[in-house]
């Protein structure tokens, strides 16, 4: 069954945590649907963003942070492992110095920490996708 | 009650027709939600687009056409009559030489015809909005 989109869930992250998302683009790549995943510092959507991950399907991925309400320097990748019309599984793992983003089991993007992952309080998944799975796995200490 | 998004409806347009849309952005303007309205030449979403109207709420509006699968010259406007968090009523009227876009009763954008409005077979409304009304009014002959 489908999860509501935008999908918002409280989350606590640290090294070893993984966020897993399964979904499907709502439109063909010609129409440039988007997927966005935002790691927020508060439960409010207007809060700062520790890690912003936005896919323009078929075109590019941009990653960034929003600090004190302002977007910082964008990191762009043309790597496009997503398939037109196909379901995807996205996993974002918290490594000691960066986020590692896997798409369908393949390491596809990295983003070095600008803000501590421990500052994350909420994850939001939204834009032009249907969502079937959202999970945060925590490192067993 | 809410209409499904993306929302797709068969439509025939000509001078005098008006497409009316009521909805609300799904996120605060800081997060840059989008609204897109596309007038397609076929019932297929990958078909050409006679009039493409995309709002990046709080930032800008772009208008364009897609002909033989390729985007043409984009028209951009910084005019932003939409209000953060507020419902909007959008009406797109087919005038003899152009589309006239009204937002909450106020004339806000125009787009000169590149392709005959009679070529339109389908209208799609999508991206980051909830949709409460969609109507196509036809000129009484």
């Amino acid at each position: 069954s489908l999860l509501p989109v935008p999908y918002t869930e409280a989350a606590s992250l640290s090294t070893g945590s993984t966020v897993t998302i399964k979904g499907r683009p709502l439109a063909c790549f010609l129409n440039e649907p988007y997927l966005q995943v935002d790691f927020h510092t508060e439960m409010k959507e207007e809060s700062d963003i520790v890690f912003h991950f936005q896919v323009c399907f078929g075109r590019r991925v941009v990653m960034n942070s929003r600090e004190y309400g302002a977007w910082k320097q964008q990191v762009e990748s043309k790597n496009m492992p997503f398939q037109d019309g196909q379901e995807f599984e996205l996993s974002i793992s918290v490594l000691p110095d960066k986020y590692q983003v896997m798409v369908n089991g393949q390491s596809s993007y990295t983003f070095d920490h600008r803000i501590k992952p421990e500052a994350v309080k909420m994850v939001q998944v939204w834009r032009d996708i249907s969502l079937t799975k959202f999970n945060v796995s925590y490192l067993k200490r | 009650s809410l209409l499904p998004v993306p929302y797709t409806e068969a439509a025939s347009l000509s001078t005098g027709s008006t497409v009316t849309i009521k909805g609300r952005p799904l996120a605060c303007f800081l997060n840059e939600p989008y609204l897109q309205v596309d007038f397609h030449t076929e019932m297929k979403e990958e078909s050409d687009i006679v009039f493409h109207f995309q709002v990046c709420f709080g930032r800008r509006v772009v208008m364009n056409s897609r002909e033989y699968g390729a985007w043409k010259q984009q028209v951009e406007s910084k005019n932003m009559p939409f209000q953060d968090g507020q419902e909007f009523e959008l009406s797109i009227s087919v005038l003899p030489d152009k589309y006239q876009v009204m937002v909450n009763g106020q004339s806000s954008y125009t787009f000169d015809h590149r392709i005959k409005p009679e070529a339109v077979k389908m209208v799609q409304v999508w991206r980051d909005i909830s949709l409460t009304k969609f109507n196509v009014s036809y000129l009484k002959r």
Partner: antibody, heavy 121, light 107 residues
Framework: EVQLVESGGGLVQPGGSLRLSCAAS????????MSWVRQAPGKGLEWVSP????????SYVDSVKGRFTISRDNAKNTLYLQMNSLKPEDTAVYYC??????????????WGKGTLVTVSS | QSALTQPSAVSVSLGQTARITCQGG??????VSWYQQKPGQAPVMVIY???ERPSGIPERFSGSSSGSTSTLTISGAQAEDEGTYYC??????????FGGGTELTVF
């Protein structure tokens, strides 16, 4: 072994210009953020301008905005600082520093020995 | 990122524990690094990511952060630890800031 060697410092009159260079070796230069940090005589450390990896945009401490320009040439493994309209208060040792990662958030793990810039008439 | 405040000087007897504080940061969100600088030399990183030590830095150096205060602790201070210590925090380039520096004396 990581090495950062600054050059281009010297004595310059107020209103003059200098271009500092930092030659980097021993690491993949293009993968790391870099920064210029200065230290006026007897004073503390002050960020001048950091630049993230592969970046064509940068930021500057308020006191040098519009006068200084940081740039990097990843092909030449070199960091630059173009300093225009120099003022006496720009007199300092200028250090080139390498970040631990592609952004400066995680700190600067290697520093050059510094080059002295003196602005005086 | 607002200014970071450090005491201008800290004294400690040989072999005792020295604590240098850094206040005013948003340390719940931003990492802290600490640097040691000896006269006429370039700074050397002694702590990064709040509490991690670069290779070659003795175990007596440690760090901790909570709220708006970060602390550098030198357990069993040695004569060679004398110098000026700077904290640094922030994230993206326009948020980076140094503390004013603390001169450590070991007597």
């Amino acid at each position: 072994e990581v090495q950062l060697v600054e050059s281009g410092g010297g004595l310059v009159q107020p209103g003059g210009s200098l271009r500092l260079s930092c030659a980097a070796s021993g690491f993949t230069f293009s993968s790391y953020a870099m920064s210029w940090v200065r230290q006026a005589p007897g004073k503390g450390l002050e960020w001048v301008s950091p630049i993230n990896s592969g970046s064509d945009s940068a930021s500057y401490v308020d006191s040098v905005k519009g006068r200084f320009t940081i740039s990097r040439d990843n092909a030449k493994n070199t960091l630059y600082l173009q300093m225009n309209s120099l003022k006496p208060e720009d007199t300092a040792v200028y250090y080139c520093a390498k970040a631990r990662t592609s952004v400066v958030a995680g700190g600067m793990d290697y520093w050059g020995k510094g080059t002295l810039v003196t602005v005086s008439s | 990122q607002s200014a970071l405040t450090q005491p201008s000087a800290v004294s400690v007897s040989l072999g005792q524990t020295a604590r240098i504080t850094c206040q005013g940061g948003k340390f719940g969100s931003y990492y802290v690094s600490w640097y040691q600088q000896k006269p006429g030399q370039a700074p050397v990183m002694v702590i990064y990511k709040d509490n991690e030590r670069p290779s070659g830095i003795p175990e007596r150096f440690s760090g901790s952060s909570s709220g708006s205060t970060s602390t550098l602790t030198i357990s069993g201070a040695q004569a060679e630890d004398e110098g000026t210590y700077y904290c640094q925090s922030g994230s993206s380039s326009d948020n980076i800031v140094f503390g004013g520096g603390t001169e450590l004396t070991v007597f």
